[in-house]
Amino acid sequence: LPAQVAFTPYAPEPGSTCRLREYYDQTAQMCCSKCSPGQHAKVFCTKTSDTVCDSCEDSTYTQLWNWVPECLSCGSRCSSDQVETQACTREQNRICTCRPGWYCALSKQEGCRLCAPLRKCRPGFGVARPGTETSDVVCKPCAPGDAVCTSTSPTRSMAPGAVHLPQPVSTRSQHTQPTPEPSTAPSTSFLLPMGPSPPAEGSTGD
């Protein structure tokens, strides 16, 4: 003979657990039905009647089989620096991600809590590490003749500044390069100003 199927609510055998998509109600001391995603428990079960489920209201959701008395509120609308990649429905929360040109500075369980604009490298600097969904751009000084530098920097008039010898880097910065991986004093070069006339050591352009 086939095993008898128990219909909810039912009292579980001592030491056994309720089946999939059922929960044990402490008050009724019965195994009762869970509500499906998109629904919540409107009336809890008793010894003689099963859980009564109802659909989630607008702007609320349940993602899992549940017996919560109220659906969860969807997150607030996406801000102007975000795009909605998943809408709020009865079965899922809204997910906001950062729009192009921005990255997630503060993430949450799903999506992003706070977006920030990606850094732009200034003249004389190029991209050392591009931005990702969760990290900002990192800039580094241009090497002489570095084509990447000119294409990644916003166009700004170049004010006169100082460069170092022997390898000039940027007219907007005064860089000197220590020896690689120093644990002792890095070597430095003296700085010279940019200009049409022969430079005098130790001055910068204003």
């Epitope: 604009p117 200034r122 990192v138 580094k140 000084p141 390069q177």
Partner: antibody
Framework: QVQLQQSGPGLVKPSQTLSLTCAIS??????????WNWIRQSPSRGLEWLGR?????????DYTVSVKSRITINPDTSKNQFSLQLNSVTPEDTAVYYC???????????????WGQGTLVTVSS | DIQMTQSPSSLSASVGDRVTITCQAS??????LNWYQQKPGKAPKLLIY???NLETGVPSRFSGSGSGTDFTFTINSLQPEDFATYFC?????????FGQGTRLEIK
């Protein structure tokens, strides 16, 4: 959470060398996104940026011209710290010296977001 | 070097007041300007970056504006903890330079 802890003497004699160290926790001196600065503050000169060191595949140093002939800023990767050496000091170098982390070197959003506690250095005989 | 001129050098105000500090650069620095707050015996603290962006965790009563050579820093509805010295700082060109500071005192 990034923390910067400064150490070094508070009194230096004229013509001697001022030496300060800044120990980093919560970041790395060889991080490819931070720069490590020394800034000083005195009633007469206000806040004065002295220089920085940072790593982007290789090490870079930038110094302000007014002290460039006397200053060295060194990273120490083994101890995760960086140091300031200022040679041939005079009473004019008396100030509170701060180390500071700079985020965003060479880009927009370039600022000092973490500072050491400050060290008052007096140059006097 | 780029000179940063702050005004006024000091000002007195009361809790609840709205105060404005200006910073003028000796040449065009785009929006490459930050504002810091410093309390006695403490290091400066970043409030505003890139002229108008509020640092995370800084109250919204602080704001900044401006571009080019003229910049403004405003505190709406002063709170007791806001009495301090405020500095602007440019990073358009090396050397990085600061304004001389504005000391905000209780009236």
């Amino acid at each position: 959470q990034v923390q910067l802890q400064q150490s070094g003497p508070g009194l230096v004699k004229p013509s001697q060398t001022l030496s300060l160290t800044c120990a980093i926790s919560g970041d790395s001196v060889s991080s490819d996104s931070s720069a490590w600065n020394w800034i000083r503050q005195s009633p007469s000169r206000g806040l004065e940026w002295l220089g920085r060191t940072y790593y982007r595949s290789k090490w870079y140093n930038d110094y302000t011209v007014s002290v460039k002939s006397r200053i060295t800023i060194n990273p120490d990767t083994s101890k995760n710290q960086f140091s300031l050496q200022l040679n041939s000091v005079t009473p004019e170098d008396t100030a509170v010296y701060y180390c500071a982390r700079e985020d965003g070197v060479g880009g927009t959003k370039d600022y000092f977001d973490y500072w050491g506690q400050g060290t008052l250095v007096t140059v006097s005989s | 070097d780029i000179q940063m001129t702050q005004s006024p050098s000091s000002l007195s105000a009361s809790v609840g007041d709205r105060v404005t500090i200006t910073c003028q650069a000796s040449q065009d620095i785009s929006n490459y300007l930050n504002w810091y707050q410093q309390k006695p015996g403490k290091a400066p603290k970043l409030l505003i970056y890139d002229a108008s962006n509020l640092e995370t965790g800084v109250p919204s009563r602080f704001s900044g504006s401006g571009s080019g050579t003229d910049f403004t820093f405003t505190i709406n509805s002063l709170q007791p903890e806001d009495f301090a010295t405020y500095f602007c700082q440019q990073y358009d060109n090396l050397p990085i330079t600061f304004g001389q500071g504005t000391r905000l005192e209780i009236k």
